[in-house]
Interface confidence: low
Amino acid sequence: GSHHHHHHGSDYKDDDDKGSQDDEFFHELPETFPSDPPEPLPHFLIEPEEAYIVKNKPVNLYCKASPATQIYFKCNSEWVHQKDHVVDERVDETSGLIVREVSIEISRQQVEELFGPEDYWCQCVAWSSAGTTKSRKAYVRIAYLRKTFEQEPLGKEVSLEQEVLLQCRPPEGIPVAEVEWLKNEDIIDPAEDRNFYITIDHNLIIKQARLSDTANYTCVAKNIVAKRKSTTATVIVYVNGGWSTWTEWSVCNSRCGRGYQKRTRTCTNPAPLNGGAFCEGQSVQKIACTTLCPVDGRWTSWSKWSTCGTECTHWRRRECTAPAPKNGGKDCDGLVLQSKNCTDGLCMQAAPDSDDVALYGS
C-alpha cells in the first residue's frame, strides 16, 4: 500500500492532517525558512483538476506554484509519499521566483480502497518562507456508465402535424451522461432542423410531425467511459384521408319520367397514408329527378276543300296540334296545305294540265 505522511511542524499542520510521522519525508521540509528577503505566499499557477478513472487507466494530477520551496500533494487529508511525486523546478526569469510543479499518479485501486462516504480527493500544498497555501480539492472518481436506461423511448403512431414527445432518461453514470438522438442512423441537430427540439431533460420533441419524420429514433447516452443506445422507437406519421370536393350534379338519368341525378367525391384530398383512416361518409350522393316525357306532334284531320277559286284551284289545310309537339317531341312530317285544280267555277285563265301544287308549312 502507499505511505501517507504529514508534517510535524506547527506552521504546516492542517486541521484535517492525519497519519504517522515519517522522517524520510520530513527531512525534506526545513524547520524554519530564511526570513530575508521576504517572499509572498505561494500562488498556484495551475491547480489540480477533477479527474475520472476510465477502466483501469490511472490518472495524473498536476499543479504548479510560485514562489515555492516545496510542493506536495495531500490526498484524503494524508500526505502522499515523497517518492510518488514527480517534481520539477525552475526560476521565473521575470520575477526571479522559484516555480515548482508536481504531478502524482492515482490508480483505480487507490480510489477503490478509500473507505467512507466522501469521494477520493487530492490537493496541492506549497510552501514559501511566508507560509503555506493549499490548492482547491480535485476529486478523482471512477467513471462508469450503467447499461440500463432509466427510461427508453416508445414507438408512436401520430397524425400529420401532431406534436410528438419521445422520452429518454439515460443510464446513471459518472460523469453524467450526455444525450443525443438518432433519426435512423443520423444524429439529430435541432439547430439544423428547427422542427426538432431536445429538452434539457433529454426528451425529443417533434414540433409538427411531417411525413419525412417517419423513422426509427434512438436515444444515445455517452460519457468518457462508454456509449449506450436505447431501444429503437419507431415513429409512424400517418395521414388521415380527406374528401375531394363534390363533382357537379349529373343530368337526370331518365329520358322520360322519374329518375335520379348523382354527384361523387373521392378520398384523395389527401389519400390516407401509413395506416391513416379512410374518409368517413358517402362518396356518392343521389337525388330524385323527373324528366318530362317528349310528345310527338300529330296532324289534325284535313279541312274541307275550299270553293273553286278564280284561279281554278281549291285547297284544304290541317294543323300539327293533335297534339302539338312538346318537351322535345318530333314535329309533324308532311303538308299543311294541299291545293289542286278544279273546273266547277269560272276561271280567269285556263287551267293547265299540271300536278297538284303543294304548300308546305314549317
Epitope: Y139, G173, I174, V176, I200, D201, H202, I205
Partner: antibody, heavy 119, light 107 residues
Framework: QVQLQESGPGLVKPSETLSLTCTVS????????WTWIRQPPGKGLEWIGY???????NYNPSLKSRVTISVDTSKNQFSLKLSSVTAADTAVYYC?????????????WGQGTLVTVSS | DIQMTQSPSSLSASVGDRVTITCRAS??????LNWYQQKPGKAPKLLIY???SLQSGVPSRFSGSGSGTDFTLTISSLQPEDFATYYC?????????FGGGTKVEIK
Amino acid sequence: QVQLQESGPGLVKPSETLSLTCTVSGGSISSYFWTWIRQPPGKGLEWIGYIHNSGTTNYNPSLKSRVTISVDTSKNQFSLKLSSVTAADTAVYYCARGRGMATLPFDYWGQGTLVTVSS
Amino acid sequence: DIQMTQSPSSLSASVGDRVTITCRASQSISSYLNWYQQKPGKAPKLLIYAASSLQSGVPSRFSGSGSGTDFTLTISSLQPEDFATYYCQQSYSTPLTFGGGTKVEIK
C-alpha cells in the same frame, strides 16, 4: 410533493463565510441538479451554481473563487458556502431543483432565506 | 455571458386584458428559455419551460413562444392573481442568466 427548505444564519459579518443548507423532502436527492440562486433586495435573480449527486458542480464565474456547493445524499441535503462576504452579498438565498442536465428549468424552490452581511 | 433583456420593465393592465412580455437574448439560444412568476415575498414559480412548454399545474392562459433571440410570454386574459413580476431565464449555456424582470401592476 417535493419540498425544499433553506436553513442557516440570517446575519453574517463581512469577510466571514456564509453557510446555508437546503433540506429536500418528498423526493430523493439522488438525481436532478441542486441549485442555489440569490436575489438582492429589490433586484433580480442571480444563479450561483449547482451540484449533481455524482459530484458534478458548475458555478457562476463571477462567484467561483468564493463558492462551494456540496451534497449529502444520506441526509437529503445540499449546502452552500460563500467565503469572504461583503455587503454586496446581502440577498434572499433560494435553493431550487433543476430538471435535466447542464442547463435546466427550476421546477421546485425553497421559500428563501434572507442573509444580511453586516458588522 | 448571455444577456437577457426584458421589456417592458413594468406595465399596468386590467383584469381580462391580454398581456404580452418580451425577452431578448444577446445571442441565439434556440428554444432554451424558461419563464417564472414571482409574487412579493415568495419564491419564483416555473410557468413555461423550453420556450413554449406549459409547466404542469399552470393555467392555460399562460403561453410562451419564440426561438433564437426573441421570446414572448402571453397571458391571454389577466386574472387578479396574475399581478406579479415575471422573469425569463436562458438555459442555453452557463452561467445561467435571468432577465431583469417585468412587473405587471393593476391599472
